[in-house]
């Protein structure tokens, strides 16, 4: 039975040219996290595997950095980065948990981070 829940940074905004941290956190389960996949709509951005470490898709290597933790840092943001991002937690024995984050990249300097939890 899947008892876990994924907490995410929710809907967030950031300035064009800036960077943002995408964070998810799996709680309320003792399941072992074996892998976390990060996707942007229909594109695989990165994978963090418990044994193999990080794999960043080559087409995103210059703008995506692993971490902190199981999170993902997006750099040199453009308005085209606006959209949905998904963290997919592969766990044993529970199975798969998915979290959703919506990022809006703004032209102006009025971008604010709306977050459900603090990013250190």
């Amino acid at each position: 039975m899947m008892t876990g829940t994924i907490e995410t940074t929710g809907n967030i905004s950031a300035e064009k040219g800036g960077s943002i941290i995408l964070q998810c956190h799996l709680s309320s389960t003792t399941a072992q996290v074996t892998q976390v996949n990060w996707e942007q709509q229909d594109q695989l951005l990165a994978i963090c595997n418990a044994d193999l470490g990080w794999h960043i898709s080559p087409s995103f290597k210059d703008r995506v950095a692993p971490g902190p933790g199981l999170g993902l840092t997006l750099q040199s943001l453009t308005v085209n980065d606006t959209g949905e991002y998904f963290c997919i937690y592969h766990t044993y024995p529970d199975g798969t948990y998915t979290g959703r984050i919506f990022l809006e990249v703004l032209e102006s300097s009025v971008a604010e981070h709306g977050a459900r939890f603090q990013i250190p």
Epitope: T34, Q35, L44, D51, H55, Y92
Partner: antibody, heavy 118, light 107 residues
């Protein structure tokens, strides 16, 4: 250098059993999911089964479920496929393949031929 | 199960030609799509993974594109060693499934 070497193929009668092995070298075997893929003569590729790093999860194609068992021995760097109740339609070259991140199959063995015939 | 439909099933081309092979999934598979090359009597070889990432050691004339349900493998300038059969494969969910293959023959 990554190497995968299958063995155990051969001629077997319908209803018989066979155990395939895949000896791995050149990488940390226990860190990777492993797969069996087969190819009937003159046909395309068909995924058969896969096993996660620590044997925690095993997956099978419907066509072999209940007849084939995938297993691994990380201390011996070896992948196995126990095939029971074999049928003529199981005749194929069987390949083992490494599956990093459970997303692609980057290294394949040379294959071992299984022929099921009376 | 996710069905993978490849087209064409075969094609004839000349050295230097630009060749395009398409693969369609029966449901969205994000970018969990890989391409393999197989020559007679040999094991398949990974060319492209995650729809568009070139596997290490594979010539840059091979490229992949697409996401969701429609994907393309392109060989920009066909070389003599490229005459082979090409397969797409989805890894979005088990069972993993392959396309039926595209045989690239010499015209």
């Amino acid at each position: 250098e990554v190497q995968l070497l299958e063995s155990g193929g051969g001629l077997v009668q319908p209803g018989g059993s066979l155990r395939l092995s895949c000896a791995a070298s050149g990488f940390t075997f226990s860190s990777y999911s492993m797969h069996w893929v087969r190819q009937a003569p003159g046909k395309g590729l068909e995924w058969v089964a896969s096993i996660k790093y620590s044997s925690s999860n095993k997956y099978y194609a419907d066509s072999v479920k209940g007849r084939f068992t995938i297993s691994r021995d990380n201390s011996k760097n070896t992948l196995y496929l126990q095939m029971n109740s074999l049928r003529a339609e199981d005749t194929a070259v069987y390949y083992c393949a490494r599956g990093p991140y459970d997303v692609w199959l980057d290294y394949w063995g040379q294959g071992t031929l299984v022929t099921v015939s009376s | 199960d996710i069905q993978m439909t490849q087209s064409p099933s075969s094609l004839s081309a000349s050295v230097g030609d630009r060749v395009t092979i398409t693969c369609r999934a029966s449901q969205s598979i994000s970018s969990y799509l890989n391409w393999y090359q197989q020559k007679p009597g040999k094991a398949p070889k990974l060319l492209i993974y995650a729809a568009s990432s070139l596997q290490s050691g594979v010539p840059s004339r091979f490229s992949g594109s697409g996401s969701g349900t429609d994907f393309t493998l392109t060989i920009s300038s066909l070389q003599p060693e490229d005459f082979a059969t090409y397969y797409c494969q989805q890894s979005y969910s088990t069972p993993l499934t392959f396309g039926g293959g595209t045989k690239v023959e010499i015209k």
